[in-house]
């Protein structure tokens, strides 16, 4: 049960809803965007003000952390289970400090299981945040400060901070350090989406959201 199902059941107001794991009674709270692009979006990540520390452990990224009404990470395990039940799209919405907004939309998104380190799988990029995917293709395993699965001899998560699908280390990290305005340039460990803003630019706000492809 995701935000798309919640929407179809008649709840069309943005807010926090209780979702359930597929084939389970286990529950999780998530923010549902019921307005953008037709609604039904399950928010799986949000950065907006630096109020939450994203330099977390593997377990924390697995189960989720933060506050669904503000900055949070929904949880790799829930997202993995959800996206392996049916086909999902992923939309990433970005804001810079100059008032610009952009997005990347992937027409097929899923995460592998924990045994496969929640590897990200993406197909079919469109949008305004770069013609090239800032999440390295083919997808990489997820890495955290205590779970180094990247392709670098270094430890990307420790150097760039945050858990992410690091390559070596690659052109994005939406879970990097949050830098406020006027401190957001020439930061090598900030919130980065390279093929929109280049390197060293740390973004103001990001949202990652998913919805069934047949919504």
């Amino acid at each position: 049960r995701d935000c798309a199902e919640v929407f179809k059941s008649g709840h069309t107001t943005n807010g926090i809803y209780t979702l359930t794991f597929p084939n389970s009674t286990e529950e999780i709270k998530a923010y549902c965007d019921m307005e953008a692009g037709g609604g039904g979006w399950t928010i799986i990540q949000r950065r907006e003000d630096g109020s939450v520390d994203f330099q977390r452990t593997w377990k924390e990224y697995k189960v989720g952390f933060g506050n669904p009404s503000g900055e949070y990470w929904l949880g790799n395990e829930f997202v993995s289970q959800l996206t392996n039940q049916q086909r999902y799209v992923l939309k990433i919405h970005l804001k810079d400090w100059e008032g610009n907004e952009a997005y990347s939309l992937y027409e097929h998104f899923y995460l592998s299981s924990e045994e496969l380190n929640y590897r990200i799988h993406l197909k079919g990029l469109t949008g305004t945040a770069g013609k090239i995917s800032s999440i390295s293709q083919p997808g990489n395993d997820f890495s955290t400060k205590d779970g180094d699965n990247d392709k670098c001899m270094c430890k990307c998560s420790q150097m760039l901070t945050g858990g992410w699908w690091f390559d070596a280390c690659g052109p994005s990290n939406l879970n990097g350090m949050y830098y406020p305005q006027r401190q957001n340039t020439n930061k090598f460990n900030g919130i980065k989406w390279y093929y929109w803003k280049g390197s060293g630019y740390s973004l103001k706000a990001t949202t990652m959201m998913i919805r069934p492809a047949d919504f």
Partner: antibody, heavy 121, light 107 residues
Framework: QVQLVQSGVEVKKPGASVKVSCKTS????????FSWVRQAPGQGLEWLGW????????NYAQKFQGRVTMTTDTSTSTAYMELRTLRSDDTAVYYC??????????????WGQGTLVTVAS | DIQMTQSPSSVSASVGDRVIITCRAS??????LAWYQQKPGTAPKLLIH???SLQTGVPSRFSGSGSGTEFALTINSLQPEDFGTYYC?????????FGGGTRVEIK
Amino acid sequence: QVQLVQSGVEVKKPGASVKVSCKTSGYTFSNNGFSWVRQAPGQGLEWLGWISGYNGNTNYAQKFQGRVTMTTDTSTSTAYMELRTLRSDDTAVYYCARDQDYSNFHWLDPWGQGTLVTVAS
Amino acid sequence: DIQMTQSPSSVSASVGDRVIITCRASQGLSSWLAWYQQKPGTAPKLLIHSASSLQTGVPSRFSGSGSGTEFALTINSLQPEDFGTYYCQQANSFPLTFGGGTRVEIK
């Protein structure tokens, strides 16, 4: 393999300008940035500045601000460094070097062979 | 700007010796540090990045260690071809800065 080939020796008079080129091959130009580093005779390494191969963003050392301009030509995969109002203490070997800009990694590999710029009246 | 202080400024050692070069940063770098080797008349060559990661093709007798403000480059069993000048470089923030260099001579 990745190669950076710089332009040849330059001899300039004080007050003149010099423009050094750095032609690259063997990799995706837009994924990387370039630092320019100089080395005066018998001295250590001094960083002049950096340019992104992706969007042309630059960052110059304060010492050279207003006197240096770094540019790229993506059609020819070439980076350029122009230094104006030359003085005798600008005599040095000037190097271009590639970094992994898209990963925010600014260690430098490989380097060009260097361009000797001599400033003398 | 971050200042990088290298020591010693020069060292003379015999083939087979262990040589340790240190580099101190004026502020914390996490692991954003690289080491280079330069031989006379040639461009510097990257040896180590991320403080301790050996660049591809560099002999395993070279190793890097440290984090924060204190770093070291160790050459185990010095070879005749290891002569030259070694530089550390911080990649934590612009402006990039180098240490003053350590000249390694073979006795």
